[in-house]
Interface confidence: low
């Protein structure tokens, strides 16, 4: 077990042109704080997966007013440390998430009126019990300035804060079976602590910080002796050798208490004594109130102004989770039909829809001919949300208002010549062909591959293409 | 005391839009948000959205998204909700309430009724 | 979306009587939930706010409890001004969302 500790040194604007606004105002006077999520490991996880080796918010800072005119200095702090206990083994590489908040001073009794300034994220390697870690890092034109370091909680040392040590017995050496504590020489390795006042005579434990009772003894601290000439206890299977019931398993076994709670056998069940900041039958529930600011976001905390009303955030649109942490991802739905392009606004999807389509999810397909016309003669053909001409004879482009050259696609076979016609183009053939595009051989007999030709024409006259 | 006036009726055109107005008094405007709520004929309650004046923030039902537009005039402590693309479906009645603690809407205007008519 | 419904969308009553109208959820909405009523002339009233908490200069014959999914609002001695539609909702989540309504009709 042990603690993360940050402190923040400073948060203003960054080096370097387009210097940022100050949030606060003479009209809107305000104030800020911190908030640290981390996560065990370098991954590169999501901004919304949970801060699962803790989080924690700092106090507000003072209230900060912008004089008019000056640019915006490096803005008051909270006073003290933020600091997210660990209640396992540090892990020595971790992700950070730091957020500035601004808090908008007034009688906010309709919700809270805070909004996200800053938020600054990093991946890095911590040694428990090492120095102060200093760092620097900007979120568009703020600047942040902030040490960090993870330290034990006595009796655990190391890097990791998983031994437990205790100052020697005896001066020379170690007692029975028990290594010196590297680095700390004068300290021994410590056996496992069982909860504080377990009998060292009846009880013993397994784990850190629980207390589990020998035959005939019982009791949150194994202090208590099961009674042998009544047989009344309360609980426990029947002792073949005495008669008498034993200690089964008691409501406290296993710890029922969440949250480092500390567990205690009641005549008829058990009672959980709750660290500060958490409460509940099982100390289950955060002692978090709206006023400590726990809905990002622009998340919208609901529920009573004392910890005994537990709080609830109302997220918007976009958001979700428990504290509105989790950025809801909704064009993953693609809700925009007809191949339109989503964009998520955060207060609102939008539908950028393809030519030929509209409306917000991109669901009507237009008539894409409405309104087009298509010059000399040309007629509209409707198609996949673009519209497009089908021109007559001797007109081509998009609508229909270019001369085509009718030769330029080289249409007259065999050798044959083309000439342009206002009504298309005649093709005059080589010896030996004919057809529209002179696309037939004259058979060598004279007779050809085709019909009769016409009255008038002889094979191998200019075949007009009507 | 806290009072939440809105006008009682608008006669409107299908395709059009109307913007109807909740004037507060009684309390710090900007503090609360406040909530509107539609009732169709002979039907129940159905929230569409809220707005923080002091912040304009806003929260919308999705399904009323791309129908309702809220903002506020802090100035005349004057919400306003903008409906757009009018049919026969939109003819209810509006509600302007405001949010106290408990998301509970304490104070309700007496309502607008908005008719779709050609 | 949480769906909230009022089984029962209109009770016949009678002046005195004891009522109770319920309201359930369709998952758990942690005590999350407000009870209203809606006079014929249109005007809405907050009744019940978090379940059980009586709004101010709300009579004390009106009370409110339940819990999980199913919650409930009971009228105790049931007066003629109580003649109107009550309607639950829930602010569990977005988007808030109420209940059908349960319209009281004298017998």
């Known amino acids: 077990a042990g603690v993360f500790e940050l402190q923040i040194h400073s948060f203003g604007p960054g080096p370097g042109p387009g210097a940022p606004r100050s949030p606060c105002s003479a009209r809107l006077p305000c104030r800020l704080f911190f908030r640290v999520c981390l996560k065990p490991g370098l991954s590169e996880e999501a901004a919304e997966s949970p801060c699962a080796l803790g989080a924690a918010l700092s106090a507000r800072g003072p209230v900060y007013t912008e004089q008019p005119g000056a640019p915006a200095p490096d803005l008051p702090l909270p006073d003290g440390l933020l600091q997210v206990p660990f209640r396992d083994a540090w892990p020595g590489t971790f992700s950070f998430i730091i957020e500035t908040w601004r808090e908008e001073l007034g009688d906010q009794i309709g919700g809270p009126a805070w909004s996200l300034l800053a938020r600054v994220a990093g991946r890095r390697r911590l040694a428990a019990g090492g120095p102060w870690a200093r760092d620097i890092q900007r979120a568009g034109a703020w600047e942040l300035r902030f040490s960090y370091r993870a330290r034990c909680e006595p009796p655990a040392v190391g890097t990791a804060c998983t031994r437990l040590c205790r100052p020697r017995s005896a001066p020379s050496r170690c007692g029975p079976g028990l290594r010196p504590c590297a680095p700390l020489e004068d300290e021994c390795e410590a056996p496992l602590v069982c909860r504080a006042g377990c009998s060292p005579e009846h009880g013993f434990c397994e784990q850190p910080g629980e207390c589990r009772c020998l035959e005939g003894w019982t009791g949150p601290l194994c202090t208590v002796p099961v009674s042998t000439s009544s047989c009344l206890s309360p609980r426990g299977p029947s002792s073949a050798t005495t008669g008498c019931l034993v200690p089964g398993p008691g409501p406290c076994d296993g710890n029922p208490c969440a949250n480092g709670g500390s567990c205690s056998e009641t005549p008829r069940s058990f009672e959980c004594t709750c660290p500060r900041g958490f409460y509940g039958l099982r100390c289950e529930v955060s002692g978090v109130t709206c006023a400590d600011g726990p809905c990002f976001n622009g998340g919208l905390c609901v529920g009573g102004a004392d910890p005994d009303s537990a709080y609830i955030c109302h997220c918007p649109p976009g958001f979700q989770g428990s504290n509105c942490e989790k950025r809801v991802d909704r064009c993953s739905l693609q809700p925009c039909r007809n191949g339109g392009l989503c964009l998520d606004l955060g207060h609102a999807l939008r539908c950028r829809c393809r030519a030929g389509f509209a409306g917000p999810r991109c669901e009507h397909d237009l008539d894409d001919c409405a309104g087009r016309a298509c010059a000399n003669g040309g007629t509209c053909v409707e198609g996949g949300g673009a519209h497009r001409c089908s021109c007559a004879l001797g007109f081509g482009g998009r609508d229909c208002r270019e001369r085509a050259d009718p030769c330029a696609a080289r249409p007259c076979a065999h050798g044959g010549r083309c000439y342009a016609h206002f009504s298309g183009l005649v093709c005059a053939c080589a010896p030996g062909y004919m057809g529209a595009r002179c696309e037939f051989p004259v058979h060598p007999d004279g007779a050809s591959a085709l019909p009769a030709a016409p009255p008038g024409l002889r094979p191998g006259d200019p075949q007009r293409y009507l | 005391q806290v009072q939440l006036q809105q006008p009682g009726a608008e006669l409107v055109k299908p395709g059009t839009s109307v913007k109807l107005s909740c004037e507060a008094s009684g309390y710090t405007f900007s503090n609360y948000w406040m909530q509107w709520v539609r009732q169709r004929p002979g039907q129940g309650l159905e929230w569409i959205g809220m707005i923080l004046p002091n912040s304009d923030i806003t929260n919308y039902n999705e399904n009323f998204q791309t129908k309702a537009t809220l903002t506020v005039d802090k100035s005349s402590s004057t919400a306003y909700m903008q409906l757009s693309s009018l049919t026969s479906e939109d003819s209810a009645v509006y509600y302007c309430?405001?949010?106290?603690?408990?998301?509970?809407?304490?104070?309700w205007g007496q309502g607008t009724s908005v008719t779709v008519s050609s | 979306d949480i769906q909230m419904t009022q089984t029962t969308s209109s009770l016949s009553v009678s002046l005195g009587d004891r009522v109770t109208i319920n309201c359930s959820a369709s998952?758990?909405?942690?005590?999350?939930l407000n009870w209203y009523q809606q006079k014929p002339d249109g005007t809405v009233k907050l009744l019940i706010y978090y379940t059980s908490n009586l709004h101010s200069g709300v009579p004390s014959r009106f009370s409110g409890s339940g819990s999980g999914t199913d919650y409930s609002l009971t009228i105790s001695n049931l007066e003629p001004e109580d003649i109107a539609t009550y309607y639950c909702?829930?602010?569990?989540?977005?988007?808030?969302?109420f209940g059908g309504g349960t319209k009281l009709e004298i017998k």
């Open positions: 909702q829930h602010y569990s989540k977005f988007p808030y969302t």
């Open positions: 998952q758990g909405i942690s005590n999350y």
């Open positions: 309430a405001r949010q106290a603690r408990y998301s509970a809407m304490d104070y």
